[in-house]
């Protein structure tokens, strides 16, 4: 059967029919339905939503929809013993306590089971001591404190502002600095955009608002007790002392009203420069400890949260492919939220729901995709990407043999300015071509393409007339598919203007104020940005599942490999003497990149010319494209990060959210001038160059003619 026969309608008409079926009004309705109560992982509320989604996906027409459950380590506050932070006087009396909950937003006063703000997986403890302000608690902030300012955090409680990097990295850095507790807070400089009112009158964070979130350093492990394997009924679980990625010191988040009370008394050193000052009316002194009059006062944390093995539920829907049912294109996003999930995740889940409905409508009319499409509603993403990772661990053998692509679908919006895409270079051309066919929702771009508004508002720093597409990092459910399994992955959402809005993420992220009304009143009243994101995500899935030849361009990988090789070489060249002393050469890497470029070019020529009516040759060429991403996987993984196995990309060791290129070499070079054994350190650089060069060369050879 040809693809057209199998799928009933001409490919062009299919895509148009699919896109035309997507409706903004439906996304709005679904978002409302998904956000009326909290859906915290491991609760009955979230299980009921899983069953509802299962039922509705079946109604929409999917071939099968199953729940996949796992028993994973989660973390919750003690219901009868709340977490808080105090200022205590010399007698140990609590003279100030932080709030125990966020004031509920209007209309939600009677909602039960709103989990109070907490740092998931914090150990229990009641440390007390002097405070040190550590800015964003980034690697460079601790370098500034320890190396330049000679401030010792050992035995101190540190207070860090949210933003710039993943909170788990902040906690890891504080632990390494010897801190005995961490207080995380949202500074208005990062979470209050000028000229906008706070919720409920605008989209800014009120003083009592607090960002929840996990503080793990899992490095892709999934469930902390079952790394590498699914947390099923017969799983062998590690003891809590051997669990992966758990923090060792108590951590708690607060809002800026409470932060003001702690920071206003700070003494000790002045902030080193203006980049350490936020927007509160406090001196931003680093400490340690409080100033003169308050020097005998201390800070005490009271943390009573518990870690519990809890059952979670993924929803997995299948739309069987007509021609290549053993090739899987996956669209997945999470369902669990910290509270109402108005943006994270339900703005994404509502879009997935509408995409499923549209595909189901086509299927009911007799159409099927060429390849199988899997739809996933992941659980426990907020607790460390657990649902997606456990499912991928359970199905890894199928996925590594059959996985064509994974498209992520968390929050559809983090702003309403322009499109934001992070993906494998293999998908660049797919994204470009698709966005040229879609209408821009942006004001001032009526009748223009999405590609045009996106390129104008977010231009590529390298190529004029093209939009910026970023590297994949982590902090979301694509991680296991891309970083561990090497399945081509991508994500798209609408974002803010990063040039004018310097705050981190969106202000109400992971707070109780992330409601349906936030989206409907302030971000996307017409749901036109949601619809556009649905068209991009859905359109990508459609093309990946239905095009006769996979819409991957290996030449784009060649271009970025050269760029990344140049970048890492220039970093290394900051140490010319050592490179000479230790005979460090990048020749092998540049040679491999050159070979990759030439072989990719020849492969692309063959791709234009081959006989697409020959199913064996077609399948062979498509397999070479599918397995190219897989070829960048090193089975041994990165040093000390066995589940980050992609040699070209990994989450930054300093910020899980960010992607790093040639991460093995990058980490080997990082802060190399401070290493006690330079010979060993430069030896590791050489080894990482060798691994990268070999991997690029090996990947190139998968594109060579097979015989």
């Amino acid at each position: 059967k040809s693809s057209n026969e199998a799928t009933n309608i001409t490919p062009k008409h299919n895509m148009k029919a699919f896109l035309d079926e997507l409706k903004a009004e439906n996304i709005k309705k679904f978002l409302y339905n998904f956000t009326q109560i909290p859906h915290l992982a491991g609760t009955e509320q979230n299980f009921q939503l899983a069953k509802q989604i299962q039922s509705q996906w079946k109604e929409f027409g999917l071939d099968s929809v199953e729940l996949a459950h796992y028993d994973v380590l989660l973390s919750y506050p003690n219901k009868t013993h709340p977490n808080y932070i105090s200022i205590i006087n010399e007698d140990g009396n609590e003279i100030f306590n932080t709030s125990l909950f966020e004031p509920p937003p209007p209309g939600y006063e009677n909602v039960s089971d709103i989990v109070p703000p907490f740092s998931a997986f914090s150990p229990q403890g009641m440390p007390e001591g002097d405070l040190v302000y550590v800015n964003y608690a980034r690697t460079e902030d601790f370098f500034k404190l320890e190396r330049d300012m000679k401030i010792n955090c050992s035995g101190k409680i540190v207070i860090a502002r949210y933003g710039k990097v993943f909170r788990g990295n902040k906690v890891k850095n504080a632990q390494l600095a010897g801190a005995k507790g961490v207080i995380l807070y949202s500074d208005p400089a990062d979470y209050f955009a000028p000229g906008v009112k706070s919720y409920p009158d605008g989209w800014n964070l009120p003083g009592g608002g607090v960002q929840r979130g996990n503080i793990l350093n899992l490095n892709g492990a999934g469930d902390p007790l079952t790394p590498g394997y699914p947390a099923n009924e017969y799983a062998y679980r590690r003891g809590i002392a051997e669990a992966v990625g758990l923090p060792s010191i108590p951590v708690h988040p607060i809002g800026y009203y409470d932060a003001q009370k702690l920071l206003e008394k700070m003494g000790g050193s002045a902030p080193p420069d203006s980049s350490w000052r936020g927007s509160l009316k406090v001196p931003y002194n680093v400490g340690p400890g409080f100033t003169g009059n308050f020097s005998t006062q201390k800070v005490k944390m009271h943390i009573h949260s518990t870690n519990e093995v809890t059952r979670i539920y993924n929803v997995i829907g299948t739309l069987r492919g007509a021609v290549e049912p053993d090739r899987y294109v996956i669209l997945g996003g999470h369902r669990d939220s910290w509270v109402f999930g108005g943006i994270d995740p339900q703005s994404g889940a509502a879009v997935v729901h509408e995409i499923v409905r549209s595909f189901g409508t086509l299927k009911k009319e007799g159409w099927r995709p060429r390849r199988t499409i899997l739809f996933a509603s992941w659980d426990a993403e907020e607790f460390g990407l657990l649902g997606s990772t456990e499912w991928a661990e359970e199905n890894s053998r199928l996925l590594q043999e059959r996985g064509v692509a994974y498209i992520n679908a968390d929050s559809s919006i983090e702003g309403n300015y322009t499109l934001r895409v992070d993906c494998t270079p293999l998908m660049y051309s797919l994204v470009h071509n698709l966005t040229k066919e879609l209408k821009s929702p942006d004001e001032g771009f009526e009748g223009k393409s999405l590609y045009e508004s996106w390129t104008k508002k977010s231009p590529s720093p390298e190529f004029s007339g093209m939009p910026r597409i970023s590297k994949l990092g982590s902090g979301n459910d694509f991680e296991v598919f891309f970083q561990r399994l090497g399945i081509a992955s991508g994500r798209a959402r609408y974002t803010k203007n990063w040039e004018t809005n310097k705050f981190s993420g969106y202000p109400l992220y992971h707070s109780v104020y992330e409601t349906y009304e936030l989206v409907e009143k302030f971000y996307d009243p017409m749901f036109k940005y949601h619809l556009t994101v649905a068209q991009v995500r859905g359109g990508m899935v459609f093309e990946l599942a239905n095009s006769i030849v996979l819409p991957f361009d290996c030449r784009d990988y060649a271009v970025v490999l050269r760029k990344y090789a140049d970048k890492i070489y220039s970093i290394s060249m900051k140490h010319p003497q050592e490179m000479k002393t230790y005979s460090v050469s990048f020749d092998s890497l540049f040679s491999a990149v050159k070979n990759f470029t030439e072989i990719a070019s020849k492969f692309s020529e063959r791709l234009q010319d081959f006989d697409k009516s020959n199913p064996i040759v077609l399948r062979m060429m498509n397999d070479q494209l599918m397995f190219l991403e897989r070829a960048f996987i090193d089975p041994l993984g990165l040093p000390d990060r066995p589940f980050y196995r992609h040699v070209i990309y990994a989450p930054s060791s300093h910020n899980k959210y960010a992607g790093e290129s040639f991460p093995g070499i990058y980490d080997a070079l990082f802060d190399i001038e401070s290493k006690v054994d330079p010979s060993k350190a430069w030896g590791e650089v050489k080894r990482q160059i060798y691994v990268a060069a070999f991997t690029v060369q090996a990947a190139a050879e998968t594109l060579s003619e097979v015989a």
């Epitope: 299980f47 028993d71 009677n110 039960s112 089971d113 093995v309 809890t310 059952r311």
Partner: antibody, heavy 121, light 107 residues
Framework: EVQLVQSGAEVKKPGASVKVSCKAS????????ISWVRQAPGQGLEWMGE????????YYNEKFRGRVTMTTDKSTSTAYMELRSLRSDDTAVYYC??????????????WGQGTTVTVSS | DIQMTQSPSSLSASVGDRVTITCRAS??????LNWLQQKPGKAPKRLIY???SLDSGVPSRFSGSRSGTDFTLTISSLQPEDFATYYC?????????FGGGTKVEIK
């Protein structure tokens, strides 16, 4: 269809023990716990405790602690409630009810038909 | 322990009447309250969970609401099959406690 089927009526002497069973079907047994509630003749309802078979955790009403033991058999999807040192005021209908195993739940959704326990000398 | 005070203990009403039953919690229980219906010789059946959510298959004439620690079950138009005893149940904190019950009888 979710069903909780309880064992038959029992007549016991004071000081004896009774063990009531509750066989579950129509759902994944380990995804839920079982609560036990009793109702004395003509009286209201009284919560005795609950057990979660996946974790093996039990939570007892202090009033019954030391006299009650709740257990489960995952292989047969059956929950048991044993009450010892029976007194005449333990005469009641004993119900099992399903409860979701999670941090937040909505308490008892499906109930067994009840088991009458009569304590009489 | 949290006390649940239910009123009235009994009421007589006719088919088609609007019936209201209340429960007061001795302390804050949020919205962690269910309403159960029990007919003579039968097991209780849950009608409403989390203060106001109807269980599947429960007619829409049943509704629940909350004002602080006061909870109300309303039957908008009493039907013959609604004559039964109704209990509230708080599950905010252990031990879970029930109201004393309200017997709805035919006038």
């Amino acid at each position: 269809e979710v069903q909780l089927v309880q064992s038959g009526a029992e007549v016991k002497k004071p000081g004896a023990s009774v063990k009531v069973s509750c066989k579950a079907s129509g759902y994944t047994f380990t995804s839920y716990g079982i609560s036990w509630v009793r109702q004395a003749p003509g009286q209201g309802l009284e919560w005795m405790g609950e057990i979660f078979p996946r974790r093996g955790n039990t939570y007892y009403n202090e009033k019954f602690r030391g006299r009650v033991t709740m257990t489960t058999d995952k292989s047969t999807s059956t929950a048991y409630m044993e009450l010892r040192s029976l007194r005449s005021d333990d005469t009641a209908v004993y119900y099992c009810a399903r409860v979701f195993d999670g941090y937040y739940n909505y308490a008892m959704d499906y109930w067994g038909q009840g088991t009458t326990v009569t304590v009489s000398s | 322990d949290i006390q649940m005070t239910q009123s009235p203990s009994s009421l007589s009403a006719s088919v088609g009447d609007r019936v209201t039953i209340t429960c007061r919690a001795s302390q804050d229980i949020g919205s962690s309250l269910n309403w159960l219906q029990q007919k003579p010789g039968k097991a209780p059946k849950r009608l409403i969970y989390a203060t106001s959510s109807l269980d599947s298959g429960v007619p829409s004439r049943f509704s629940g609401s909350r004002s602080g620690t006061d909870f109300t079950l309303t039957i908008s138009s009493l039907q013959p099959e609604d004559f039964a005893t109704y209990y509230c149940l708080q599950y905010a904190s252990s031990p879970y406690t029930f109201g004393g019950g309200t017997k709805v009888e035919i006038k």
